[in-house]
């Protein structure tokens, strides 16, 4: 019965970009301005998303697809479909309630979003420190100390424990 009814339903003939207008004897009417229908057979059109304030339009709304937003420079998207915009920080910082703060010694952030993370502990993999970390960059791990023969090509001696100019924060 359901299948029979759907076959007889005149609304099922209405394509995307239109809606089945009950006020006009169920004929297919185009979606009004600033609205869309992405599938056929819809009885109403959805209101287009408007990208305002910190949001900017990445893709304009059409009769068959919603607008897509991203964030203005200095902000980045969070959430499905860029539902929120969050302030960017510099590399080597993280966003706190009080704004962007430098990563503490022993942590780094190589991106403009997210949190400062602890440097990699090379010894967990039985490796040695090849290059020290900074607040912007992680430690680089090299071959395990036992692998190092005199003149081994891919290793330089470990640098001092703290890079010049990077005091504990």
């Amino acid at each position: 019965f359901e299948r029979t009814r759907s076959l007889q339903d005149p609304c099922s003939n209405c394509p995307a970009g239109t809606f089945c207008d009950n006020n006009r004897n169920q004929i297919c009417s185009p979606c009004p301005p600033n609205s869309f229908s992405s599938a056929g057979g819809q009885r109403t059109c959805d209101i287009c998303r408007q990208c305002k304030g910190v949001f900017r339009t990445r893709k304009e709304c059409s009769s068959t697809s919603n607008a897509e937003c991203d964030c203005t420079p200095g902000f980045h998207c969070l959430g499905a479909g860029c539902s929120m915009c969050e302030q960017d920080c510099k590399q080597g910082q993280e966003l706190t309630k009080k704004g962007c703060k430098d990563c503490c010694f022993g942590t780094f952030n190589d991106q403009k979003r997210g949190i400062c993370r602890p440097w990699t502990n090379c010894s967990l993999d039985g490796k040695s420190v090849l290059v020290n970390g900074t607040k912007e960059r992680d430690v680089v791990c090299g071959p395990s100390p036992a692998d190092l023969s005199p003149g081994a090509s891919s290793v330089t001696p470990p640098a001092p424990a703290r890079e010049p100019g990077h005091s504990p924060q």
């Epitope: 991106q111 403009k112 602890p118 990699t120 502990n121 290059v131 791990c141």
Partner: antibody
Framework: EVQLLESGGGLVQPGGSLRLSCAAS????????MSWVRQAPGKCLEWVSV????????YYADSVKGRFTISRDNSKNTLYLQMNSLRAEDTAVYYC????????????????????WGQGTLVTVSS | QSVLTQPPSASGTPGQRVTISCSGS????????VTWYQQLPGTAPKLLIY???HRPSGVPDRFSGSKSGTSASLAISGLRSEDEADYYC???????????FGCGTKLTVL
């Protein structure tokens, strides 16, 4: 030995879609960042997208943002690139690349470079 | 145009030393590790240098990398005919939230 085998390339019309796959073997796939890098005929390398194994985070080049989607299936050791709304300028050889630095021990792979590459698959966008 | 600037070509004779430069900015080379790739004709790229100056095992010590400020360099000493290839620098760019490649330098061994 690291092996990466791309497939899914071919001829597609502008506005069309393609899905590329990259079958990985010889390493613990679930422990490494994976990227797609492309090279138009006679042109330079262009990074397309990366996916992290630990948090599933993805990043895209501005030229493909909103059109391409990178994904991975760690149970199948396979990397994917879904390409929609293709344009003539997307014509290129697409390489799958493995990053160095195994996660979660390594926090960031950017120092270690892309130490494993496939042979590439050609995508041609033309009417 | 690429975010990282490389000379389009370089050349040298066998046995010579050649240097290829790669120039960027504080958002990429200045605060991130540089990697170098070699692409022989008709093949996929191969990692040559990682973390600015370190060689993966199997890469000859004729290849060396260095970095100063927002520029990086790849030096090849004792040039050989088999070194004829395209060489690319690459790094992470935090402001773009992505990796960036230079447009490559074609090395010709005369």
């Amino acid at each position: 030995e690291v092996q990466l085998l791309e497939s899914g390339g071919g001829l597609v019309q502008p506005g069309g879609s393609l899905r590329l796959s990259c079958a990985a073997s010889g390493f613990t796939f679930s422990g490494y960042d994976m990227s797609w890098v492309r090279q138009a005929p006679g042109k330079c390398l262009e990074w397309v997208s990366v996916i992290y194994p630990d948090d599933g985070n993805t990043y895209y080049a501005d030229s493909v943002k909103g059109r391409f989607t990178i994904s991975r299936d760690n149970s199948k050791n396979t990397l994917y690139l879904q390409m929609n709304s293709l344009r003539a300028e997307d014509t290129a050889v697409y390489y799958c690349a493995k990053h160095g630095g195994q996660k979660p021990t390594t926090k960031s792979s950017s120092a270690y470079g892309m130490d494993g590459w496939g042979q590439g698959t050609l995508v041609t966008v033309s009417s | 145009q690429s975010v990282l600037t490389q000379p389009p070509s370089a050349s040298g004779t066998p046995g010579q030393r050649v240097t290829i430069s790669c120039s960027g900015s504080s958002s990429n080379i200045g605060n991130n590790y540089v990697t170098w790739y070699q692409q022989l004709p008709g093949t996929a790229p191969k990692l040559l240098i990682y973390a600015d100056s370190h060689r993966p095992s199997g890469v000859p010590d004729r290849f060396s990398g260095s970095k100063s400020g927002t520029s990086a360099s790849l030096a090849i000493s004792g040039l050989r005919s088999e070194d004829e290839a395209d060489y690319y620098c690459a790094t992470w760019d935090y402001s773009l939230s992505g990796y960036v490649f230079g447009c490559g330098t074609k090395l010709t061994v005369l």
